[in-house]
């Protein structure tokens, strides 16, 4: 008799794929002809693009009125007219809903100022946030983000209160908190009192770009957080290129999409957007490169392969990889909610298996190093439920040159420098 199927876990929408942060709506528009509509209306015109990325939610803003460092002139219920109107926002919500994209609103109060939380007037600000949560939930948003919570006194208790409001409205609403901290103990203390909170941090940003160190960070985090759902990113707001050299972007995309939890990206991560390559652009929010006309400031600064347009037409581009990974992440049970087992594969490598019941299983092998390596996959580290076969089919490599779909012998696996492999193999009873 066939074994009984394992009961599927209850999954919320943010469990099913990536979140996409658009912190600066004006930068996201691009310059030149991309900048024709007010930013919120302009974003509506980009929803088809966002659908093509298969992202499940947009984290927007902040877009509320905020006069730098002036709590009296900060109104979390009013949209800053530079971004558009409440009507524009309502229209965006409706359009996003039709495309099954959720909208999360960033309510970090003093986003233009020195201290995001007006440190001397915490109670006033907390009341404003409470009122804003209720107002925007009624308006139809799907969740909220608050950043820099290390600057918020009594953050844990405020977050618990805001979580209650959010979940009290609907279990289907999400609260995301962001911190600049990379300290696991600080992160755990924030998570302790808030069971459904999604926390973005700089925890992975000091991974030192070695396989062993990354493996140890990931496994420590998963062990410490138990079976709670987590998110994966390199920071609470910044682009991957702020932390990674270009040659590691593909590797990290593969990793973030295949770890157990919600991957969180910033606009431009899908094309390797890099402020350093755009003279005069701010590191934290460079202009999005839709096509060569998006940055007319310096003629010739932008080549086609840096843009959405150029990369969309290249099956070997970072954008094409992002789309493929996002698609896999959103439809494969083992990647959606499967178990995770990391195991030894030799120095410099990080490898793990994702598996769920009798569904297809996935093996990820990542070479963070500058030299090619042979993988010595130590299957003895794995439980019986996650044993390795002799061969697995190559679903994709982060590097060109491999024949996709071909079976690879796991005993003889060799990885190029900075190469990541995603392999698949069937369940065997």
């Amino acid at each position: 008799r066939a074994p009984r199927c394992r009961e599927l876990p209850a999954q919320k929408w943010w469990h099913t794929g990536a979140l996409y942060r658009i912190g600066d709506l004006q930068a996201f528009q691009g310059h030149g002809a991309g900048n024709l509509a007010a930013p919120i209306s302009g974003l509506k015109g980009r929803l088809d693009y966002l659908s093509s990325l298969k992202v499940k939610g947009l984290v927007l803003g902040p877009i509320h009125k905020n006069q730098k460092d002036d709590v009296a002139q900060t109104d979390l219920l009013q949209i800053d007219p530079n971004f558009g109107s409440k009507e524009d926002f309502d229209s965006l919500l409706q359009s996003a809903k039709k495309k099954s994209i959720r909208v999360i609103l960033d309510l970090t109060p003093n986003y233009r100022g020195e201290n995001s939380w007006f440190s001397t007037q915490v109670d006033t600000v907390a009341t404003k946030v409470k009122d804003a949560l209720e107002f925007w939930l009624q308006a139809g948003v799907d969740g909220f983000q608050v950043r820099d919570i290390e600057n918020l006194k009594d953050a844990s208790s405020f977050l618990a209160e805001w979580q209650n409001i959010t979940k009290g409205f609907s279990e289907d609403r999400l609260l995301i908190a962001g911190t600049n901290s990379s300290d696991l103990q600080q992160i755990l203390s924030l998570l302790e009192s808030n069971k459904d909170l999604l926390l973005t941090s700089s925890y992975l940003s000091d991974s030192g770009s070695t396989g062993e160190h990354t493996k140890s960070l990931v496994t420590q985090y998963l062990n410490a957080t138990g079976n709670r759902w987590c998110s994966w990113s390199l920071s609470q707001a910044r682009l991957l290129t702020s932390f990674l050299p270009a040659q590691l972007l593909r590797l990290y995309q593969l990793m973030l999409f295949t770890l157990p939890g919600t991957p969180v990206f910033s606009y431009g991560d899908e094309i390797g957007l890099d402020a350093a390559a755009l003279p005069g652009q701010p590191m934290e929010a460079p202009v999005m490169l839709w096509d060569e006309s998006s940055f007319p400031d310096i003629p010739g600064a932008v080549s086609a392969n840096m843009t959405v347009k150029g990369q969309s037409e290249d099956p070997g581009s970072l954008l094409s990889l992002f789309r493929r990974l996002s698609d896999q992440r959103s439809k494969e049970r083992s990647l959606l909610h499967g178990d995770f087992h990391a195991f030894s594969a030799g120095p410099g490598l990080f490898s793990y298996i994702r598996h769920w019941d009798q569904n297809e299983r996935f093996l990820v092998v990542l070479n963070f190093g500058d030299v090619g390596l042979s993988a010595g996959l130590q299957a003895s580290d794995l439980p019986a439920s996650a044993s390795l076969p002799a061969k697995a089919d190559l679903l994709l490599s982060t590097q060109p040159g491999r024949e996709e779909g071909s079976p690879l012998e796991l005993e003889r696996l060799k990885l190029e420098p900075h190469e990541g492999l995603l392999l698949r193999f069937p369940y065997a009873a």
Epitope: A33, A38, S41, D48, D88, W290
Partner: antibody, heavy 123, light 108 residues
Amino acid sequence: QVQLVESGGGVVQPGRSLRLSCAASGFTFSSYGMHWVRQAPGKGLEWVALISYDGSNKYYTDSVKGRFTISRDNSKNTLYLQMNSLRAEDTAVYFCASLGAPTYSYFSDMDVWGLGTTVTVSS
Amino acid sequence: DIQMTQSPSSLSASVGDRVTITCRASQSISSSLNWYQQKPGKAPKFLIYAASSLQSGVPSRFSGSGSGTDFTLTISSLQPEDFATYYCQQSYSTPPITFGQGTRLEIK
């Protein structure tokens, strides 16, 4: 409902000027880029000019550059086209429209046209 | 500038017919193509955006397809109100926006 109404057309001699207006209602005019498109008698559609939501970016087709100026007054929900040094080949019905932005992967569902105003340039 | 060429320039058909109009771009425009319908003395009406997405309120007998340089507009079963001129328009990147020269669809 969403509406655009053009006015200001008429018969004018070559070399003279004319100012077209387009009054918008039923949508947040100040949030959208706006275009002028023309259609010569018995001919197809020709894009003329566009202006961004805040007036900071303007673009023109080559044949009108230096002669036509697009502008807007968001407080009055009105779009303008100042046409100087008019030529016989400028004779057309002029439509104002909201067509979205001409950049890669931008798709606007906000596509509204006025009924047009007729400009005839003749001596 | 990107040139748009429609064919045929005019076309006679009967109510109930299936009709196809093609539009070719002088260079690849991905799927950045819109279709409009215009009746005499009226403003153009937006039918299809992004090559194949139907604008709300447009009857499902209209459909669009194609990407790159070759596009088609199909009317699956012509109705009396469909006799008009049809224009394709590219909005691929950077002005100018360009239209095809139009296809006049008349009753046979």
